[in-house]
């Protein structure tokens, strides 16, 4: 799988995580910080 950084327009796409561009899927993926979940790392869990 080819991975690169997200385009600048997607700054802020991931609320609590790192934005990764999955080239082969032509979409972003959020790698969430510990304690966060959701497509955009928008949910906090204990």
């Amino acid at each position: 799988v080819s991975i690169t950084k997200c385009n600048s327009d997607m700054n802020g796409y991931c609320l609590h995580g790192q934005c990764i561009y999955l080239v082969d899927m032509s979409q972003n993926y959020c790698r969430c910080e510990v304690g966060y979940t959701g497509v955009r790392c928008e949910h906090f869990y204990l």
């Epitope: 385009n7 600048s8 327009d9 997607m10 802020g12 796409y13 032509s26 497509v39 955009r40």
Partner: antibody, heavy 116, light 106 residues
Framework: QDQLVQSGAEVKKPGASVKVSCKAS????????IQWVRQAPGQGLEWMGR????????KYREKFEGRVTITADTSTNTAYMELSSLRSEDTAVYYC?????????WGQGTLVTVSS | DIQMTQSPSSLSASVGDRVTITCKAS??????IAWYQQKPGQAPRLLIQ???TLQPGVPSRFSGSGSGTDYTFTISSLQPEDIATYYC????????FGGGTKVEIK
């Protein structure tokens, strides 16, 4: 399956406003950005702007700034594009498009005709 | 706004010909360019993204290359079903389409 269903064709007088809706099903608009693109008859594609429905953050093309308003209602999974002070050159098909980086899913388009 | 200058605006070629379309960005777009095909009455279809990544189901005669501000889209052997208008799209910073290239059969 995933769908974007837009409102029907509109005929407007110059100076009026139009509001086009775009209802999503099969996915949550909060997971994406919703972009708006238009195409005048026989002309090219023109990006107008986009909304991040989760953050309610909008970005517009400079030429439309102050004339276009993009909104989203996450409770109904619907996005809207309102264009004011219409002129004849705004006659076009208006598309809403789901994106997570790319334009990966298009609505069927809404024809807006501006005519006196 | 980033400007995308696409050329030519139209071209006529024979079946089997190699067809090349170029797009020049007003600033570095870091390979974030896509190419779309649009046929009359249809929504655009994504062919290539991130400069050179072919979408599933797209024939291998379509290809893309480039970096920085200069990008190229190529049809290696034009087929009758390729008659359409092609657009580049930069998606590094917001979105901008090129003006389009109408491809016709000679």
């Amino acid at each position: 399956q995933d769908q974007l269903v837009q409102s029907g064709a509109e005929v407007k007088k110059p100076g009026a406003s139009v509001k086009v809706s775009c209802k999503a099903s099969g996915f949550n608009i909060k997971d994406t950005y919703i972009q708006w693109v238009r195409q005048a008859p026989g002309q090219g594609l023109e990006w107008m702007g986009r909304i991040d429905p989760l953050r309610r953050n909008t970005k517009y093309r400079e030429k439309f700034e102050g004339r276009v308003t993009i909104t989203a209602d996450t409770s109904t999974n619907t996005a809207y594009m309102e264009l004011s002070s219409l002129r004849s050159e705004d006659t076009a098909v208006y598309y809403c498009v789901r994106s997570r980086t790319l334009f990966d899913f298009w609505g069927q388009g809404t024809l807006v005709t501006v005519s006196s | 706004d980033i400007q995308m200058t696409q050329s030519p605006s139209s071209l006529s070629a024979s079946v089997g010909d190699r067809v090349t379309i170029t797009c020049k960005a007003s600033q570095d777009i870091h390979k974030y360019i896509a190419w779309y095909q649009q046929k009359p009455g249809q929504a655009p279809r994504l062919l290539i993204q991130y400069t050179s990544t072919l979408q599933p189901g797209v024939p291998s005669r379509f290809s893309g290359s480039g970096s920085g501000t200069d990008y190229t889209f190529t049809i290696s052997s034009l087929q009758p079903e390729d008659i359409a208008t092609y657009y580049c799209l930069q998606y590094d910073n917001l979105r901008t389409f090129g003006g389009g290239t109408k491809v016709e059969i000679k």
